[in-house]
């Protein structure tokens, strides 16, 4: 299975890095400093 961070979730994380957790088959965002939220869209 391809990493969805390189495909359909390429632009999912607004101010952060997309990470695909294989064990959970889920995408999460590692936010840049000062940003938070599911998509790192809140400051």
């Amino acid at each position: 299975k391809k990493n969805p961070c390189n495909a359909e979730f390429q632009n999912f994380c607004i101010h952060g890095e997309c990470k695909y957790i294989e064990h959970l088959e889920a995408v999460t965002c590692k936010c840049q400093q000062e940003y938070f939220g599911e998509r790192c869209g809140e400051k």
Partner: antibody, heavy 125, light 112 residues
């Protein structure tokens, strides 16, 4: 209450096959990765296989790769281990284990938080 | 592959003693300040039980006399005051995202 119950162990001849099952209850099975861990008599713990929540990703050590296949049926809350071309060194108690985890700020940390009671597999002629 | 080595392999101690078990990884199991190292207790004929996760977090229901510390390649499990029910075998395990997810060889804690 989280419960994991293994079954399917027994005596099998070298080169033979066996299918282990693990029945899960007390939690949302489809939300957790699962693993098999074994313990040879008088020896330590050895990780055998892991499967992701939906079954898309499977992992094996070199010692069982190509011989063992892990699978799951989320509708039945069940985990399986198909073991082929069995060898004497596969003799062990086989445990199924749940992957507990922390997921925060992009970090994923996991651990085996619940274990079954184990099922004994003996490979001998 | 990451190898995990525990020391000592066996240990004799008395009730009330402070006991330390160490676990060394062949390479770092840290990532950006997080340590991917867990500790388990196993009694004869029983399944292992999680004690400590992420190097220093006490699993729910585990007595506070158990603690974990360390980072990088060197980790420690400490029992501050041994109780009769603590005599068992202890295992460390690395849980980085890269398999194989290896265990240490175990430390058997016996009554002196």
């Amino acid at each position: 209450e989280v419960q994991l119950v293994e079954s399917g162990g027994g005596l099998v001849k070298p080169g033979g096959s066996l299918r282990l099952s693990c029945a899960a209850s007390g939690f949302t099975f489809s939300s957790y990765a699962m693993s098999w861990v074994r313990q040879a008599p008088g020896k330590g713990l050895e990780w055998v296989s892991t499967i992701s929540t939906g079954g898309s990703h499977t992992y094996y050590p070199e010692s069982v790769k190509g011989r063992f296949t892990i699978s799951r049926d989320n509708a039945k809350n069940s985990l399986y281990l198909q073991m082929n071309s069995l060898r004497a060194e596969d003799t062990a108690v086989y445990y199924c284990a749940r992957h507990g985890y922390l997921l925060y700020e992009g970090y994923y940390e996991w651990y085996f938080d619940y274990w079954g009671q184990g099922t004994l597999v003996t490979v001998s002629s | 592959d990451i190898q995990m080595t525990q020391s000592p392999s066996s240990l004799s101690a008395s009730v009330g003693d402070r006991v330390t078990i160490t676990c060394r990884a062949s390479q770092s199991v840290d990532y950006e300040g997080h340590s991917f190292l867990n500790w388990y207790q196993q009694k004869p004929g029983k399944a292992p039980k999680l004690l400590i996760y992420a190097a220093s977090n006490l699993q729910s229901g585990v007595p506070s006399r158990f603690s974990g510390s360390g980072s990088g390649t060197d980790f420690t499990l400490t029992i501050s005051s041994l109780q009769p029910e603590d005599f068992a075998t202890y295992y460390c395990q690395q849980s980085t995202e890269n398999p194989p997810y290896t265990f240490g060889q175990g430390t058997k804690l016996e009554i002196k």
